[in-house]
Amino acid sequence: HPSPAPPDQLNTSSAESELWEPGERLPVRLTNGSSSCSGTVEVRLEASWEPACGALWDSRAAEAVCRALGCGGAEAASQLAPPTPELPPPPAAGNTSVAANATLAGAPALLCSGAEWRLCEVVEHACRSDGRRARVTCAENRALRLVDGGGACAGRVEMLEHGEWGSVCDDTWDLEDAHVVCRQLGCGWAVQALPGLHFTPGRGPIHRDQVNCSGAEAYLWDCPGLPGQHYCGHKEDAGAVCSEHQSWRLTGGADRCEGQVEVHFRGVWNTVCDSEWYPSEAKVLCQSLGCGTAVERPKGLPHSLSGRMYYSCNGEELTLSNCSWRFNNSNLCSQSLAARVLCSASRSLHNLSTPEVPASVQTVTIESSVTVKIENKESRELMLL
């Protein structure tokens, strides 16, 4: 099948609430519950999560939240008593206004005109913030994830069913199937649908075989298919790489640990804008590539690729995608050069024939932008044909 056409996209970042990424459903989560599919409803407002107002919580919103989280329908929607005493009654006529403080500290509500997440809206300051909180218990504890691909948007496909994480067999696995996975996870669209052994094999049960999505399904478990049963082994675990997955390489240097910083994102390689490229960003990149630590940030050259990516790290992140990042889709880096870095494991520093790479878990970026982890002491080069 041809790859689904990427949707037109606006500028995006790692901490955005107004513009939802392709495939992202609702900026909601459930906390303090018995599973990821029950608990107090919280909505994302800019950089923080706030409890959703219980006074305006209804069955439509509960149904939409459960569906958006891949948890089936809603089994029970309720309100949690507030942590503080109940609200006072409306003020008697003639009393001084008490709105000043309560108004500004209003709680957000999730308002839905139907039971589908597309019909929902987060409305800020919709309720008195010391009122009841929305709670929901969803019917199914189902979930989906991508594992061992160097980020949440690439890796081996795993489904949670009956309390157990398991794989999906790669028989008939194609871009339409991967597209459903990517969209469900808020990871954009599918760049690659990968057969077994591109990522480390799974260990649990194999939940699905002969998956045959049209590409329009909201959840992977809505796609036609067979139970995993006995016909597949973990050498046939399906994988996916989504457009929102980021992988990195250094080019134009003495080896893979030195050069111009390039990120594969949304199907193309991009240079990184050096206007926000500091030691903390360089350190995270060198470490994530298994190249030691950053030694210097050589002066950049003009962008040889479209330069649209900015990163801001504190230096403790595992990869650059864990940092705050910004992808400017409409403008190239203004008045900046392409970021470069020299890592401590580069042979241009050590005059070694091969760079020193940590032996435990090595992150390898391979052609076509798939990032995998190889858990042995030998360095192996993987190529996708």
């Epitope: 409306p90 509500a109 308002l111 409305v123 300051h125 919709a126």
Partner: nanobody, 123 residues
Framework: QVQLVESGGGLVQPGGSLRLSCSAS????????LGWFRQAPGKEREFVAA????????YYADSVKGRFTISRDNSKNTLYLQMNSLRAEDTAVYYC????????????????WGKGTLVTVSS
């Protein structure tokens, strides 16, 4: 007791505009979230639009989004509903509502109702 009095209803042609007002007797007007509901002949009462205490947050029914605008003037104790591109299906009695605890999107949170003003859209 908050008294809500609607005005501005009337007969208008399809595609036309009307502005409804709702004045409140209550001096603590700004303590209430406000909204509009409507009831067409033979139909159930339905939510139209709501606005929070300070007017910073609004919410609309899908059927009126992009055509109706809710606003409030706390200094005048008045709520407004600007209705543009009116359609025959907008014909209804429009009720002003006030709520203390939450924006009046669902009927169970509403503390006070006005008596209503009739809007008729017909050629």
């Amino acid at each position: 007791q908050v008294q809500l009095v609607e005005s501005g209803g009337g007969l208008v042609q399809p595609g036309g505009s009307l502005r409804l007002s709702c004045s409140a007797s209550e001096r603590t007007f700004s303590d209430y979230a406000l909204g509009w509901f409507r009831q067409a002949p033979g139909k159930e009462r339905e939510f139209v639009a709501a606005i929070n205490w300070v007017g910073g947050s609004t919410y609309y029914a899908d059927s009126v989004k992009g055509r109706f605008t809710i606003s409030r003037d706390n200094s005048k104790n008045t709520l407004y509903l600007q209705m543009n591109s009116l359609r025959a299906e907008d014909t209804a009695v429009y009720y002003c509502v006030a709520s203390w605890g939450a924006m009046p999107v669902l009927t169970h949170v509403i503390n006070y109702w006005g008596k209503g003003t009739l809007v008729t859209v017909s050629s």
